[in-house]
């Protein structure tokens, strides 16, 4: 008799989960010789402990603390650039200015970045059928609770000048309930950080609009300003020549507005 | 085959200065990370400082930080530590090593006493 | 005071297994690859056994390591009196941004 196995809304754990973080695990260190020491074997237990065996609706932060220990990546805390509904992008912006950092460039966010994952309640098994939806099942599921986790280690590691890449085709440039709105901006610490600064990234090649003056984008205004850090907007109407004069800065035609 | 040879070590004050020196051969120099570790008299190892290939980033001891500096030059094959405000807990062989691409240290030289003493 | 605690010496007779422990913390042992390096007076330190368990070779088959949690240690089976020796551990501490050794433990072959 097969054994009862609860049935979520969410796709189940990404197939082979276990061997892709182990991978990732060592080609991030491969890449990044500054993590050459770094045991992966030791970093998929910490993994695994933090969901096996547990119920996928009752994940805490504290059941990532053992895996966070490693989070002390150096990453420059300057260089650091957020996104909101605009993940590619972002990460090709990083590709090309390689001195600046997005979460899914640091070790930990490289090996879940798209991912899946969830255990079962008292088994030691990874459900590869489904795993909680953060709308339809709960919030507390071990991928929705691991981004909270570092996301929210992120922006507190943040100083200085602080970017952010929003999606200006969204009818919210600035969503309150993204990660960004709900865990990355209030976890920014006024001490250390002075400015954040807004890029807004246009989808129409014919939008000339200043998205910056978006009622969402001043109410993430308002609630940067009350946390007594500046707040400056930009917009990026061109993207791809964006990218282009990021690569090649000198380009004569890099110096007028993008 | 690999050798590494630390030359500079001698007697000087405490508040000196002191510049060692480790050249290397047998290897490409150039692609690897390099280290200083040293051994105060009657004690055990102790990580000093290490270098990284490419464009440079240094990494020091807290008890070394701000004192000395750790460099390279790739086009002599060469490692150096500059060793300022030199105090008595400074003395010791210091060692140079060549770090393998998962942080151990592969290959060593065979030291050069420094002695800070008044 | 070093970050990784290893006992000050151990002893064995000729052909007797030594075991050597190294314990330390989730910023060094736990998330790192362990080295242990043997180190004979007046010569170099020779590294032994990298990422935990490897040997570089050269290095006979009677030296072995193992890593659990926040601990490793070496074991030396057929002990020689060549053996005699320094042995540390050593592994990259998060917490200091740097490598951090135990304090060293003295291998003595008996009789």
């Known amino acids: 008799v097969p054994r009862w196995r609860q049935q979520w809304s969410g796709p189940g754990t990404t197939k082979r989960f276990p061997e892709t973080v182990l991978a990732r695990c060592v080609k991030y260190t491969e890449i990044h010789p500054e993590m050459r020491h770094v045991d992966c074997q030791s970093v998929w237990d910490a993994f695994k402990g933090a969901f096996i065996s547990k119920h996928p609706c009752n994940i805490t932060e504290e059941d990532y603390q053992p895996l966070m220990k490693l989070g002390t990546q150096t990453v420059p805390c300057n260089k650091i650039l957020l996104w909101s509904r605009i993940k590619d992008l972002a990460h090709q912006f990083t590709q090309v200015q390689r001195d600046m950092f997005t979460l899914e460039d640091t070790l930990l966010g490289y090996l879940a970045d798209d991912l899946t994952w969830c255990g079962e309640f008292n088994t030691s098994k990874i459900n590869y059928q489904s795993c909680p939806d953060w709308r339809k099942d709960c919030s507390n599921n071990p991928v929705s609770v691991f981004w909270k986790t570092v996301s929210r280690r992120f922006a507190e590691a943040a100083c200085d000048v602080v970017h952010v890449m929003l999606n200006g085709s969204r009818s919210k440039i600035f969503d309150k309930n993204s990660t960004f709105g709900s865990v990355e901006v209030h976890n920014l610490q006024p001490e250390k950080v002075q400015t954040l600064e807004a890029w807004v990234i246009h989808g129409g090649r014919e939008d000339s609009r200043d998205l910056c003056q978006d009622p969402t984008i001043k109410e993430l205004e308002s609630i940067i300003s009350k946390r007594n850090i500046q707040f400056s907007c930009k917009n990026i109407y061109r993207p791809d020549k964006f990218l282009q004069c990021v690569k090649n800065p000198e380009d004569s035609s890099c110096t007028s507005e993008i | 085959q690999v050798q590494l040879v630390e030359s500079g070590g001698g007697l000087v004050k405490p508040g000196g200065s002191l510049r060692l020196s480790c050249a290397a051969s047998?290897?490409?120099?150039?692609?690897?990370?390099m280290s200083w570790i040293r051994q105060a008299p009657g004690k055990g190892l102790e990580w000093v400082a290490s270098?990284?290939?490419?464009?440079?980033?240094?990494y020091y001891a807290d008890s070394v930080r701000g004192r000395f500096t750790i460099s390279r030059d790739n086009a002599k094959n060469s490692l150096y530590l500059q060793m300022n405000s030199l105090r008595a807990e400074d003395t010791a062989v210091y060692y140079c090593?060549?770090?393998?691409?998962?942080?151990?240290?592969?290959?060593w030289g065979q030291g050069t006493l420094v002695t800070v003493s008044s | 005071q070093s970050a990784l605690t290893q006992p000050p010496s151990a002893s064995g007779t000729s052909g007797q297994r030594v075991t050597i422990s190294c314990s330390g913390s989730?910023?060094?042992?736990?998330?790192?690859?362990v080295y242990w390096y043997q180190h004979l007076p007046g010569t170099a330190p020779k590294l032994l056994i990298y990422?935990?368990?490897q040997r570089p070779s050269g290095v006979p088959d009677r030296f072995s390591g193992s890593k659990s949690g926040n601990s490793a240690s070496l074991a030396i089976s057929g002990l020689r009196s060549e053996d005699e020796a320094d042995y540390y551990c050593?592994?990259?501490?998060?917490?200091?941004?740097?490598?951090?050794f135990g304090s060293g433990t003295k291998v003595t072959v008996l009789g």
């Open positions: 090593a060549r770090e393998g691409w998962s942080g151990e240290f592969t290959d």
């Open positions: 047998g290897f490409t120099f150039s692609d690897d990370y």
């Open positions: 270098v990284s290939n490419g464009r440079p980033t240094t």
């Open positions: 989730s910023s060094n042992i736990g998330f790192h690859f």
């Open positions: 990422k935990n368990n």
């Open positions: 050593a592994a990259w501490d998060d917490s200091l941004s740097g490598y951090v």
